[in-house]
C-alpha cells in the first residue's frame, strides 16, 4: 500500500528542556523524524491474466510504483528468480530484451511497466496455479520484487487484480541492520518526545488517501495478498496439481526473520544517499542480490545509458548488464 504519513506540527522543545537536552541532542531526533516521515514506499504490482482465446496462454503485467529509474526487470515463474524460480524474461530499458521459453513476447508497456505473453502449449506451459514474479532493479531504491498468480476460480479472460508482493525477502543483513537502526531511531524519537513534552507524543497517522489512489492504470491491489503478509515467502508449485503453499526460509538458517514487519526493509545506499532512500512498504519486499553492489567498492549503479542487474567491473557507466547489473 502506498500510505503516506501525515505529521502533526511539532512544537520546538520548551525553553526549559533546551538546557537539559542541548542543541546537539536535538539533532538526532529530528534527523530520525525526517527519515521516518519522508521515507517513500516503492511498490511492485503484478497482474496475471489468462487469455480467453487460448486457455493455457497467459499475460503477465508488472509495474513499478516508485520515483527511481528502472535499470532492469526480471520476470520468472515458480517463485522469485534467485529462489527456485525459472527465468522467463529480462528487460533492460536501453539494451534490449531477452526471453526464455515459454515466453512469446516481452515488452515495455510504459517506462515503468512491462508485459509478457506466455505460450500455451508444451511441457513448460504455465497452468492456473503458477506463481509469476517480477523483480525491478531501480536506482536508488534497489531491487524490488512482487509475485502473483491467477485465483483458483478465474474465468478465462478475467484477470487477477495486481498483487503487491506478500512477503519481504532481505538478502543482505545490512538491510535488516539499517532497518533496525531506523526502527530503533523512531522508537527512541517517540520516547524522547514523550519524555520531554508535557503532551503525548504525536502519532503518525496513515493518510486517508485510498490505497487504490491513482496508480498506473488504476490497478487495485488484492486484499488476498494483504492477508498473506505474514508469509515470508510463498512458493506455489508449477505443476498443474493443487497448489501447495510453502514457507521458505533462508538456506540452512533459522526462520527468525519470518516475523519481521514487511515495512521495515531498507537498503543502505552510501554515506549520504541513505537519508532519502525510500523504505519498502507492506506490499513489496526489497531484494538486493548479494553481488549487486559488492564489486570492488563500486557505487550503486545509476542508469546512465543502462544499468544491469549485476555489477559491472568497468565502472558506473558500464553497469548495464543483463540479468541484473552489468
Amino acid at each position: 500500500m502506498r500510505t503516506e504519513a501525515q505529521v502533526p506540527a511539532l512544537q520546538p522543545p520548551e525553553p526549559g528542556l533546551e538546557g537539559a537536552m542541548g542543541h546537539r541532542t536535538l539533532v538526532l531526533p529530528w534527523v530520525l523524524l525526517t527519515l521516518c516521515v519522508t521515507a517513500g514506499t516503492p511498490e511492485v504490482w503484478v497482474q496475471v491474466r489468462m487469455e480467453a482465446t487460448e486457455l493455457s496462454s497467459f499475460t503477465i503485467r508488472c509495474g513499478f510504483l516508485g520515483s527511481g529509474s528502472i535499470s532492469l526487470v526480471t520476470v520468472s515463474w515458480g517463485g522469485p528468480n534467485g529462489a527456485g524460480g525459472t527465468t522467463l524474461a529480462v528487460l533492460h530499458p536501453e539494451r534490449g530484451i531477452r526471453q526464455w521459453a515459454p515466453a512469446r513476447q516481452a515488452r515495455w508497456e510504459t517506462q515503468s511497466s512491462i508485459s509478457l505473453i506466455l505460450e500455451g502449449s508444451g511441457a513448460s506451459s504455465p497452468c492456473a496455479n503458477t506463481t509469476f514474479c517480477c523483480k525491478f532493479a531501480s536506482f536508488p531504491e534497489g531491487s524490488w520484487e512482487a509475485c502473483g498468480s491467477l485465483p483458483p476460480s478465474s474465468d478465462p479472460g478475467l484477470s487477477a487484480p495486481p498483487t503487491p508482493a506478500p512477503i519481504l525477502r532481505a538478502d543482505l543483513a545490512g538491510i535488516l541492520g539499517v532497518s533496525g537502526v531506523l526502527l530503533f531511531g523512531c522508537v527512541y524519537l517517540l520516547h524522547l518526545l514523550r519524555r520531554h513534552k508535557h503532551r503525548p507524543a504525536p502519532r503518525l497517522q496513515p493518510s486517508r488517501t485510498s490505497p487504490q489512489a491513482p496508480r498506473a492504470r488504476a490497478w487495485a491491489p488484492s486484499q488476498a495478498s494483504q492477508a498473506a503478509l505474514h508469509v515470508p515467502y510463498a512458493t506455489i508449485n508449477t505443476s498443474c496439481r493443487p497448489a501447495t503453499l510453502d514457507t521458505a526460509h533462508p538456506h540452512g538458517g533459522p526462520s527468525w526473520w519470518a516475523s519481521l514487519p514487511t515495512h521495515a526493509a531498507h537498503r543502505p545506499q552510501g554515506p549520504a544517499a541513505w537519508a532519502s532512500t525510500p523504505i519498502p512498504a507492506r506490499g513489496s519486499f526489497v531484494s538486493v542480490e548479494n553481488g549487486l553492489y559488492a564489486q570492488a567498492g563500486e557505487r550503486p549503479p545509476h542508469t546512465g545509458p543502462g544499468l544491469t542487474l549485476f555489477p559491472d567491473p568497468r565502472g558506473p557507466r558500464a553497469m548495464e548488464g543483463p540479468l541484473g547489473v552489468r
Partner: antibody, heavy 114, light 113 residues
C-alpha cells in the same frame, strides 16, 4: 576486468559432438546471462541462444534447437556450448558473450572434417 | 524472424571522410511503451570478436570514440563515422535486440583507400 576465455580450436569428425567452454571472470557470473553467436568463415553473425548461469535456464534460436545445448557451471564460472551430430555446416567460429553482448570471448574455431 | 538488411555491403573511403551505413529491420524495433529502439551496432576487425559500439540505436558504449554515431528509429537506422580513421577498417553489423531470435544484419565492410 571482465574476461571471457574460450577453449582452443577443435578439429572433429562428422557425426560426432564437441563441447566448447567459456570461462568468465571479473564479474558476478550468475548475475549476467551468456549468449552464444556463430560465425561461419567469411560470413555474418548468427545468434544461437542465451543461458542464465544462475538458474541454468537456456533459450535457443529455433534454428539451433537440437544442434546446440547450452549449460553453465557456477562453481567454475564457466559456460559451455555442446554441438551434436556435426556436419560441415557446423564448421565455424563460436563466440560467447556477456553483458548484453558488450563483452566477447576470443572465439573458438570448430572445424568438421572427415 | 526479424530480417535485418544492411547496405551497402561494402564501401571504400579515404581517411578523414565521413561515412554512413544503413540498417533496415523487417519490423519496428521501437518499443512504444518506453520509446526506446532496441538496435545495436558492432564493429568486427579481422581476426577479432565483434565489439559493441552502439546500443539503444544511439547510445555509445563506454570507450567508443565519439566519431561513431548511431541514429534512426523504428525500422530505419544509420551508423555514421564522422571522420574515418585507418583503424576503422572492419565489418559493421547491426542487431535486433527486441525480438527473439536476436538477429544480425549481413554486415557492411568498410575499406580504407
Amino acid at each position: 576486468q571482465v574476461q571471457l576465455q574460450q577453449s582452443g580450436a577443435e578439429l572433429v569428425r562428422p557425426g560426432t559432438s564437441v563441447k566448447v567452454s567459456c570461462k568468465a571472470s571479473g564479474y558476478a557470473f550468475i548475475n549476467n546471462f551468456i549468449e552464444w553467436v556463430k560465425q561461419r568463415p567469411g560470413q555474418g553473425l548468427e545468434w544461437i541462444g542465451v543461458i542464465n548461469p544462475g538458474s541454468g535456464d537456456a533459450n535457443y534460436n529455433e534454428k539451433f534447437k537440437g544442434k546446440a545445448t547450452l549449460t553453465a557451471d557456477k562453481s567454475s564460472t564457466t559456460a559451455y556450448i555442446q554441438l551434436s551430430s556435426l556436419t560441415s555446416d557446423d564448421s565455424a567460429v563460436y563466440f560467447c558473450a556477456s553483458h548484453w553482448l558488450a563483452y566477447w570471448g576470443q572465439g573458438t574455431l570448430v572445424t568438421v572434417s572427415a | 524472424d526479424i530480417v535485418m538488411t544492411q547496405s551497402p555491403s561494402s564501401l571504400s573511403v579515404s581517411a578523414g571522410e565521413k561515412v554512413t551505413m544503413s540498417c533496415k529491420s523487417s519490423q519496428s524495433l521501437l518499443s512504444s511503451g518506453n520509446q526506446k529502439n532496441y538496435l545495436a551496432w558492432y564493429q568486427q576487425k579481422p581476426g577479432q570478436p565483434p565489439k559493441l559500439l552502439i546500443y539503444g540505436a544511439s547510445t555509445r558504449e563506454s570507450g567508443v570514440p565519439d566519431r561513431f554515431t548511431g541514429s534512426g528509429s523504428g525500422t530505419d537506422f544509420t551508423l555514421t563515422i564522422s571522420s574515418v580513421q585507418a583503424e576503422d577498417l572492419a565489418v559493421y553489423y547491426c542487431q535486433n535486440g527486441h525480438f527473439y531470435p536476436y538477429t544480425f544484419g549481413g554486415g557492411t565492410k568498410l575499406e580504407i583507400k
